[in-house]
Each structure stands twice: as structure tokens, then as C-alpha cells.
């Protein structure tokens, strides 16, 4: 029987910069029941606080609700593992909420086949940013990525859309049913999950184009 091994805080995420959650990985348990506690202070403070919510994020997590989350202060945190034989501490971790945002997927993805008389046909798609993200503040820039594939294909084709919320694709296989998805990330945050798939049937008379795609 031994003291617990060193835990590691390995992940912190915020859906919208207003709340965030951090998760740790326990070290070895030393063969005894082990208790974990997360303590933190914010930059400019010396007073240590204990994790306000060990429940919301699931096992080995600490959730910081709205009243505990500040975008303007770096959090300095550490996990303590304790059993009957002793204690061990994780390395200190520094968290700036700006850099851990993982938004919800974009919303309202719509996909249409456009067949203008004077130009080659193309696939046109548009979407909306996730509702929890406040883009009006200016500092929150979302980047988007699209992926699509014929229904029975194994490989996805991906396109980076930058900050646009609409996109054209010119090269598709006629007569195929395509799945289309979109995801987003802040410039220094993390990719969202992919949006639910939208299906689109490409007409059999859709003319393939040599130019692959272009931004709207």
C-alpha cells in the first residue's frame, strides 16, 4: 500500500466563455481509496478556493459555473490526491478561458443545388453560428470547416471556409446522394463536434466542373 500517484489535469473546455470544466487523470491509487480535490486561485489573488462543483462534468472533473468564471483572470489550479498513506499533487495548471473555448456545432445547415442558366451548376450551403457564442463582442472569431461525401463512400472531402457562413462547391458526382456537415472553432480554441448531417441529392444532369470549389 502506497500514497497515490501524481494526478494530471489534462483538459479544460468552455462552451461559450461563460462557464468551463477541467478534467484530471488520477495517478496510481496506491491500492487504497483515494480522495481528490481541486484547488485554484486567480491571477492577482493569494487566496486558494476549492472546486465549486465536482458533479456537473462527471468523474474526475471540476465545473466552474457562471459566477466562478472570469475571462479576465488566469486561473492557477492543482489537484490533490490523498489516501491513508499520504498525498500527491498535480503540476500547477494555468487556464485562460479565452483559449479553451469549444463551441457547440453550427446551426441551421441548409444545402441546395444551384443550376444557373449562364454558369455551371454548384452546391451552395449556408449555416448559422452556434447560439451560445456571442460574436458581437468582436474578439470571438469563428472559423468553419465543411465535410461532405457520397452516402456510400468511406472518405470525407473537407473544405476550410474561413469566417464565412456560406460556401460553394463546384465539383460533385452527378446522381449521388451526399452527406454534408459543418463544424466551427475559435482561432485559439477547439473544433466543435460536427453538425448533424444534411442530405442532398445531386441531379443526374449535374455537370462536373474542373474547378474544385471557391469561397462565396
Amino acid at each position: 500500500q502506497l500514497p497515490p500517484g501524481k494526478p494530471e489535469i489534462f483538459k479544460c473546455r468552455s462552451p461559450n466563455k461563460e462557464t468551463f470544466t477541467c478534467w484530471w487523470r488520477p495517478g496510481t491509487d496506491g491500492g487504497l481509496p483515494t480522495n481528490y480535490s481541486l484547488t485554484y486561485h486567480r491571477e492577482g489573488e493569494t487566496l486558494m478556493h476549492e472546486c465549486p462543483d465536482y458533479i456537473t462534468g462527471g468523474p474526475n472533473s471540476c465545473h466552474f459555473g457562471k459566477q466562478y468564471t472570469s475571462m479576465w483572470r488566469t486561473y492557477v489550479m492543482m489537484v490533490n490526491a490523498t489516501n491513508q498513506m499520504g498525498s500527491s499533487f498535480s503540476d500547477e495548471l494555468y487556464v485562460d478561458v479565452t483559449y479553451i473555448v469549444q463551441p457547440d456545432p453550427p446551426l441551421e445547415l441548409t444545402v441546395e443545388v444551384k443550376q444557373p442558366e449562364d454558369r455551371k451548376p454548384y452546391l451552395w450551403m449556408k449555416w448559422s453560428p452556434p447560439t451560445l457564442i456571442d460574436l458581437k463582442t468582436g474578439w470571438f472569431t469563428l472559423l468553419y470547416e465543411i465535410r461532405l461525401k457520397p452516402e456510400k463512400a468511406a472518405e470525407w472531402e473537407t473544405h476550410f471556409a474561413g469566417q464565412q457562413t456560406e460556401f460553394k462547391i463546384l465539383s460533385l458526382h452527378p446522381g449521388q446522394k451526399y452527406l454534408v456537415q459543418v463544424r466551427c472553432k475559435p482561432d485559439h480554441g477547439y473544433w466543435s463536434a460536427w453538425s448533424p448531417a444534411t442530405f442532398i441529392q445531386i441531379p443526374s444532369d449535374f455537370i462536373m466542373n474542373d474547378h474544385h470549389h471557391h469561397h462565396h
Epitope: 494530471e8 489534462f10 487523470r25 491571477e43 492577482g44 475571462m71 487556464v95 485562460d96 479565452t98 473544433w191
Partner: antibody, heavy 118, light 112 residues
Framework: EVQLVQSGAEVKKPGSSVKVSCKAS????????IHWVRQAPGQGLEWIGE????????NYNQKFKGRVTITVDKSTSTAYMELSSLRSEDTAVYYC???????????WGQGTLVTVSS | DVVMTQTPLSLSVTPGQPASISCRSS???????????LHWYLQKPGQSPQLLIY???NRFSGVPDRFSGSGSGTDFTLKISRVEAEDVGVYFC?????????FGGGTKVEIK
């Protein structure tokens, strides 16, 4: 203990490429961004670019865009910085550095001297 | 790119005496999220840089309290209240508000 261990010194000809490695240990590699910074002899520091090892998303200094490629190998917890079309002005010590969930550099590799000379 | 200008270029200090280094940026370092990402690094002779101060005034873990940072907007200062022999090296200010991140040219601190 967090460690970033870089590959050894290189001597390269003008016009060639160099690939410097940075092996990380002591933490979960995919958790934190890795940055590359260089320092020419007797000079200041210059940021080259950064990579998020979780998804290989990169940002580059426009000055190096087109000549630099930053990659990772998650299976070996190693980041790489490849610089092409080398010229004598690229002679420098190249550092990898790691952030936390922040945008400043808490841990640095020991540096790799790249000498470009004909 | 944001230009970071440090003064003085070098500084010779008697042990136990204070030292001050100035850093000026060519544009405001206040991020649109309200934070100011101005940091100070020390590069001791023959070593890699090490973080001293993050976000203007916050000492990194293990940094002695004789180091302090202050400033706002475009003007920033690093102070060492009582210089010790182990403080010799080149001090760099750095900004990570704007991409590309940039560094000052460095201030070399020597002991008299």
C-alpha cells in the same frame, strides 16, 4: 516532469531544407499548443508559428508562410518544424516551447542550432 | 507586426541594488477580450529563455518576489527590487495579443 527535448545541431546548404524535432514528455502531448521560436546569433527572439497537437491546426508567422511547415506525430509525442529554401539569414537556434491553456510559453526545449552555409 | 522596443540595451547593476527595464509596443496590447498579453522572459547565459512574468504583472510559478511587472496599453516595466548574481542574462518582453507574437530586442543585465 515536463520536458521538451530537441534534435541535434544541423549544418545545411543554402536552398535546402531542415527538419527539427521536439519530443515532449511528462504530460499529455495533445493537451497544449507547441510553438516554434528562433534566435539568430546575438539577436532577439522571433516567433515562427504554433500547432495544436490535438488536431494539427496551425498558425504561422506570415514572414515564414510558404517556407515553414509545423507538424506533429501523436504516436511519439513529437512536434516538427521544417523550414525550406534555406538562406544564410536562417542561421539561428530554433526552440520549441509549450503553453498551458494560455498563449504564453511556460516550457522551452534546449534549442537546436541550424547553420546555413555554403 | 507589433514592434516591441526595449530600453536600455544593457544594464550594469551592483548586487542588492534595484534595476528597471522598459518595454514599449507600437500599438496597444489590450486584447479585444480585455486582457493584456505582455510577458517577460529571462535568458540566462547558455540557456533557453524562461518565463518570469505573464500578463503584465503576474509572477510565474517559482519566480522570486523581487521581480515585478507593471504597465498598461503600450508602456510596460519590469523591476528587480534587489539584483542578485543569478539574475544576469538577457531579459525579453513579449506580446501575444496580436499574431504574429513578437519580442523585444532584449536587455542585457550584468553585475558590477
Amino acid at each position: 516532469e515536463v520536458q521538451l527535448v530537441q534534435s541535434g545541431a544541423e549544418v545545411k546548404k543554402p536552398g535546402s531544407s531542415v527538419k527539427v524535432s521536439c519530443k515532449a514528455s511528462g504530460y499529455t502531448f495533445t493537451s497544449y499548443w507547441i510553438h516554434w521560436v528562433r534566435q539568430a546569433p546575438g539577436q532577439g527572439l522571433e516567433w515562427i508559428g504554433e500547432i495544436d497537437p490535438s488536431d494539427s491546426y496551425t498558425n504561422y508567422n506570415q514572414k515564414f508562410k510558404g517556407r515553414v511547415t509545423i507538424t506533429v506525430d501523436k504516436s511519439t509525442s513529437t512536434a516538427y518544424m521544417e523550414l525550406s529554401s534555406l538562406r544564410s539569414e536562417d542561421t539561428a537556434v530554433y526552440y520549441c516551447a509549450r503553453s498551458f491553456f494560455t498563449n504564453w510559453f511556460a516550457y522551452w526545449g534546449q534549442g537546436t542550432l541550424v547553420t546555413v552555409s555554403s | 507586426d507589433v514592434v516591441m522596443t526595449q530600453t536600455p540595451l544593457s544594464l550594469s547593476v551592483t548586487p542588492g541594488q534595484p534595476a528597471s527595464i522598459s518595454c514599449r509596443s507600437s500599438q496597444s496590447l489590450v486584447h479585444s477580450n480585455g486582457n493584456t498579453y505582455l510577458h517577460w522572459y529571462l535568458q540566462k547565459p547558455g540557456q533557453s529563455p524562461q518565463l518570469l512574468i505573464y500578463k503584465v504583472s503576474n509572477r510565474f510559478s517559482g519566480v522570486p518576489d523581487r521581480f515585478s511587472g507593471s504597465g498598461s496599453g503600450t508602456d510596460f516595466t519590469l523591476k528587480i527590487s534587489r539584483v542578485e548574481a543569478e539574475d544576469v542574462g538577457v531579459y525579453f518582453c513579449s506580446q501575444s495579443t496580436h499574431v504574429p507574437f513578437t519580442f523585444g530586442g532584449g536587455t542585457k543585465v550584468e553585475i558590477k
